[in-house]
Every structure is written in structure tokens, then in C-alpha cells.
């Protein structure tokens, strides 16, 4: 939820909203809730229907570090289990990926690089 | 597989809040949507709403919304609809049902909710 | 809120027969359509989900059909054990809604 600070003069100093819940579906046009003491509100608000690439996929997954490298493919894999669906989303339960293994040098820049994204 | 368990029945006073607890065994409870449905005796079925253990997400229908919270205890695999200042009206049975759009849902057997001075 | 009319609200049969259960949506819900069945004092069991997907544990006997606003549930050939209400149950948009039922009895 998050806290907002009205204007001075108005009777409430600070409103709490809610999340934007759609009206139908997972997107468009829906409601979103405000409390300030005793007092409510309830204002429109929109949810994008490009949420998917907004906000990640259908399907999101808990990954575990990646694996040593395989000398034979070259590749190195980790598994990721199933962490949130969309209502309607049929997600694989657990999921394999893998990406090409690369040298030591270029491990560490890509860390620095990408670090917190794996 | 998920197993869903339910007390079998609560007794409330009118007007004094009551939670119903739902505790999840098998597979990841914290996985899956969890819903909240209400059976009045010898009606149908109607939705209450439902709640995501991995952030607490809750989407209620807004018949239910000054009448029924939902939470998540993720240490104890339990889900929890508190309902507030219940009158003869809201006593039904309260199913919880664990949903995956790939497999299906699990349901639990249903707590019969008695209102009753 | 999505309204869903089941149709019959009752259905006297004989085991043996075969029949079709009909839930009608007041705008279109695309596959987003399941069936339960509920026998008295149990809890509901899904049958179908999104229409026409059958579900583990199911007999195959039990299958659905449609899109959009018109979905059907068929039970080939029905058996004594299959005796009991249905519900088809809505998950386009909020609130989840379902229908009234059809009472499924032994003529």
C-alpha cells in the first residue's frame, strides 16, 4: 500500500490506497481503496493490458543458483519452481532452462554487469 | 497432491468475529490461489474471494468486502477468512479450494458456520 | 457481475443414458468455463476446466464443449454414482460467479 500526503487544508494529512484491483480480468479499468482515519475513498484507476511485459510473464518462478558447467554441451542449468500464476495461467510446475557457459573473465563482468538479475 | 483441512464446525455469537482456518499438506501451498466459497443451507455456490500466499494478494468480491478478510500464514501452510460481526445470514458451509489453472483445484471438506445466540 | 443459466434446473434420468448439461453466460467468458459436481453434504469436484480440458481422476465419461457465451457438459452414458448437482463456474473476470445448478436424479 502506499501513503500519500494531501495538501494542507484538507481534513486528512494522509491517505493510505490500496492496490488498482481491475473490474474484470487482469487489466483495464477497476477501483482502487483509500483510508485517511475513518474516512474512505474509492477512485477509479487502470491496470495496463500490456501488464505482462510491464510488470514479467504469467509465470513466475523461484530459480535456484545455476549448476557447474557441462564440458559437453557447454551449457549450464538451473531449476525454477513455480512462485505465482495469473488465475488462468496453466504453468509448468517446475521449469529447466539453461544458457551458454562462459569464460572466467567474462563471468565476472557479467556479474558486475548483471548483478541481482539471475 | 494438496490437502485442504477444515474444522468440521464453528459456533459464533451474532455480532462476534469468527476465523476460519484452512491448513494446506502435499504439494506448495504457497503456489497456489487459494479460495474462499460460501454454501447457504440448500442454495448454490458463491465466491467470496481469494488470496495468493507467495504476497498476500487478494482479490475479494465486493459483496464480501466489509464482511470477509483473508490471510496467509506461510509458516503454517494455513489460510484464514475472518468474518466480522456475522449475523443468522451468514450461516452456510465455508469451503477453501486450492487452484492451479494446469492441474485443477483441491477442495477442503467445508467448515459449517453456525450463528447463533 | 457475469451472470451463468444452467439449463434444465432438474434432469430425471436413467442410468444408461447419456445427457447434455447446458450453462449459458450473459457475455462472452471465451474457455474460461469449469463444471463441478457436488453430492449432497460433500465438498464440489472439478470435472472440466477452461470448457473442455479433463481433469486427472475423472471418468472419461464426462466431457465438455463451447466458447464464448453457450458451453455444454456430457455424461456418456450416465452411471448410478453420477447422481447429484453441477455447477459450471465462471473465470473470466471478478467476482468468480456460478450458476444456479441442474439437479441431475434418478427418474
Known amino acids: 500500500k502506499k501513503k500519500e500526503k494531501v495538501k494542507k487544508g484538507s481534513e486528512c494529512s494522509e491517505w493510505t490506497w490500496g492496490p488498482c484491483t481491475p473490474s474484470s480480468k487482469d487489466c483495464g479499468m477497476g477501483f482502487r481503496e483509500g483510508t485517511c482515519g475513518a474516512q474512505t475513498q474509492r477512485v477509479h484507476c487502470k491496470v495496463p493490458c500490456n501488464w505482462k511485459k510491464e510488470f514479467g510473464a504469467d509465470c513466475k518462478y523461484k530459480f535456484e543458483s545455476w549448476g557447474a558447467c557441462d564440458g559437453s554441451t557447454g551449457t549450464k542449468a538451473r531449476q525454477g519452481t513455480l512462485k505465482k500464476a495469473r488465475y488462468n495461467a496453466q504453468c509448468q510446475e517446475t521449469i529447466r532452462v539453461t544458457k551458454p557457459c562462459t569464460s572466467k573473465t567474462k563471468s565476472k563482468t557479467k556479474a558486475k554487469k548483471g548483478k541481482g538479475k539471475d | 497432491q494438496v490437502q485442504l483441512q477444515q474444522p468440521g464446525a464453528e459456533l459464533v455469537r451474532p455480532g462476534h468475529s469468527v476465523k476460519l482456518s484452512c491448513k494446506a499438506s502435499?504439494?506448495?501451498?504457497?503456489?497456489?490461489?487459494m479460495n474462499w466459497v460460501r454454501q447457504r443451507p440448500g442454495q448454490g455456490l458463491e465466491w467470496i474471494g481469494m488470496i495468493h500466499p507467495s504476497d498476500s494478494e487478494t482479490i475479494l468480491n465486493q459483496k464480501f468486502k466489509d464482511k470477509a478478510t483473508l490471510t496467509v500464514d506461510i509458516s503454517s501452510n494455513t489460510a484464514y477468512m475472518q468474518l466480522s460481526s456475522p449475523t443468522s445470514e451468514d450461516s452456510a458451509v465455508y469451503f477453501c479450494?486450492?487452484?492451479?489453472?494446469?492441474?485443477?483445484?483441491?477442495w477442503g471438506q467445508g467448515t459449517t458456520l453456525t450463528v447463533s445466540s | 457481475d457475469i451472470v451463468l443459466t444452467q439449463s434444465p434446473a432438474t434432469l430425471s434420468v436413467t442410468p444408461g443414458d447419456s445427457v447434455n448439461l447446458s450453462c449459458r453466460a450473459s457475455?462472452?467468458?471465451?474457455?474460461?468455463l469449469h463444471w463441478y459436481q457436488q453430492k449432497s453434504h460433500e465438498s464440489p469436484r472439478l470435472l472440466i476446466k477452461?470448457?473442455?480440458q479433463s481433469i486427472s481422476g475423472i471418468p472419461s465419461r464426462f466431457s465438455g464443449s463451447g466458447s464464448g457465451t453457450d458451453f455444454n457438459l456430457s455424461v456418456n452414458s450416465v452411471e448410478t454414482e453420477d447422481f447429484g448437482m453441477y455447477f459450471c463456474?465462471?473465470?473470466?473476470?471478478?467476482?468468480?460467479?456460478f450458476g444456479a445448478g441442474t439437479k441431475l436424479e434418478l427418474k
Open positions: 463456474q465462471q473465470s473470466n473476470s471478478w467476482p468468480l460467479t
Open positions: 479450494s486450492s487452484w492451479s489453472a494446469k492441474r485443477g483445484d483441491f
Open positions: 477452461y470448457a473442455s
Open positions: 502435499g504439494q506448495s501451498f504457497s503456489s497456489y490461489w
Open positions: 457475455e462472452s467468458i471465451s474457455n474460461n
